[in-house]
């Protein structure tokens, strides 16, 4: 399987909220001994590999933001801890999972990574990740709503 990032760049005004999204593509094993671990973190475009460094999102680590379930179940994170930080990560039945960040500030700008670990008990872990950039802007040049740029082209879409 692979992870797709529908949008590679999100440009948002301060105070707005944004939902960063990743999607699992390809065959997903739903066997008894296969489970999935999904999470989010901030990173940098490192020398070794993008997303290899794991930094907290608003002081929440990737452990705090993880989703854990079998291949066909929906899930969301512990609401209390995440929501106190204006965050919520969630996953649906169709392989899409996301993190929503409320009340954006300039400090939220940076590279965000989603990580999916397919755990084949008795065999191995298979990791895949996706990366996307968030730019939070302020002032007269800031958009009124988030503008997202698809990964496949440079066309932009307005998110209201």
């Amino acid at each position: 399987f692979k992870v797709a990032t529908p949008y590679s760049l999100y440009v948002c005004p301060e105070g707005q909220q944004v939902t960063l999204t990743c999607r699992l593509l390809g065959p997903v094993d739903k066997g008894h001994d296969v489970t999935f671990y999904k999470t989010w973190y901030r990173s940098s475009r490192g020398e070794v590999q993008t997303c290899s460094e794991r930094r907290p999102i608003r002081n929440l680590t990737f452990q705090d933001l993880h989703l854990h379930h079998g291949g066909h179940q929906a899930a969301n994170t512990s609401h209390d801890l995440a929501q106190r930080h204006g965050l919520e990560s969630a996953s649906d039945h169709h392989g899409q999972f996301s993190i929503t960040m409320r009340n954006l500030t300039l400090l939220d700008s940076g590279l965000y990574c989603c990580l999916v670990v397919e755990i084949r008990h008795h065999h191995s872990e298979h990791r895949v990740h996706g990366a996307m950039e968030l730019q939070v802007q302020t002032g007269k040049d800031a958009p009124s709503n988030c503008v997202v740029y698809p990964s496949s082209s440079q066309d932009s879409e307005n998110i209201t």
Epitope: S52, F62, Q63, H68, L115, I119, H123
Partner: antibody, heavy 117, light 107 residues
């Protein structure tokens, strides 16, 4: 802050079953892998196996025929049973939290188990 | 299973010196390698994950490098509390395996 505490007898007779329990406090046991590792005197660390929060288990092939790891989520505990022990099973036994695609990040302080008649 | 070989077995150094510890894998583990520190009577403590990322609260004098089969843990300037045994561990597949350890002792 998550903390782990091993408990169980410090002395087991040869051919008997070693039984240890790890109590998880300060956090949920309903995530991650919960692992057992041991360190025989004068030797290195050896991974015994884990139980995943979902109930799936995975054991070191070198010990698989003798190992059972179980979990009691209502008590926030997971347990190790090692049957038919010999003197070679004398070791400090550690329980640890293992996070997928990460590492063994939190360990218990360890409990010494001696196999002797 | 993947065998991890650590060298040297013992490293005798003085405080303030640089320590370089090696871990070699019998087959590629990509960068899925961790380093732990263990002091007598204590549990191992996670230092480095994914070959080069410091775990939370680990001082900057500890750094990891390498990928594939050859890895290095470097302690840039030894502090008195750094004298301990260091283990590498792979997690590219199960069973998880550890190296035999390198003891860093005071010269």
């Amino acid at each position: 802050q998550v903390q782990l505490q091993e408990s169980g007898p410090g002395l087991v007779k040869p051919s008997e079953t070693l039984s240890l329990t790890c109590t998880v406090s300060g956090g949920s046991i309903s995530s991650y892998y919960w692992s057992w590792i041991r360190k025989p005197p004068g030797k290195g660390l050896e991974w015994i196996g884990y139980i995943y929060y979902s109930g799936s288990t995975n054991y070191n092939p070198s010990l698989k025929s003798r190992v059972t790891i179980s979990v009691d989520t209502s008590k926030s505990q997971f347990s190790l049973k090692l049957s038919s022990v010999t003197a070679a099973d004398t070791a400090v036994y550690y329980c640890a939290r293992d996070i997928p695609a990460f590492a063994l990040d939190i360990w218990g302080q360890g409990t010494m188990v001696t196999v002797s008649s | 299973e993947i065998v991890l070989t650590q060298s040297p077995a013992t490293l005798s150094l003085s405080p303030g010196e640089r320590a370089t510890l090696s871990c070699r894998a019998s087959q590629s583990v990509s960068y899925y390698l961790a380093w732990y520190q263990q002091k007598p009577g204590q549990a191992p403590r996670l230092l480095i994950y994914d070959a080069f990322n410091r775990a939370t609260g680990i001082p900057a004098r500890f750094s990891g490098s390498g990928s594939g089969t050859d890895f290095t843990l470097t302690i840039s300037s030894l502090e008195p509390e750094d004298f301990a045994v260091y283990y590498c561990q792979q997690r590219i597949n199960w069973p998880l395996t550890f190296g035999g350890g390198t003891k860093v002792e005071i010269k």
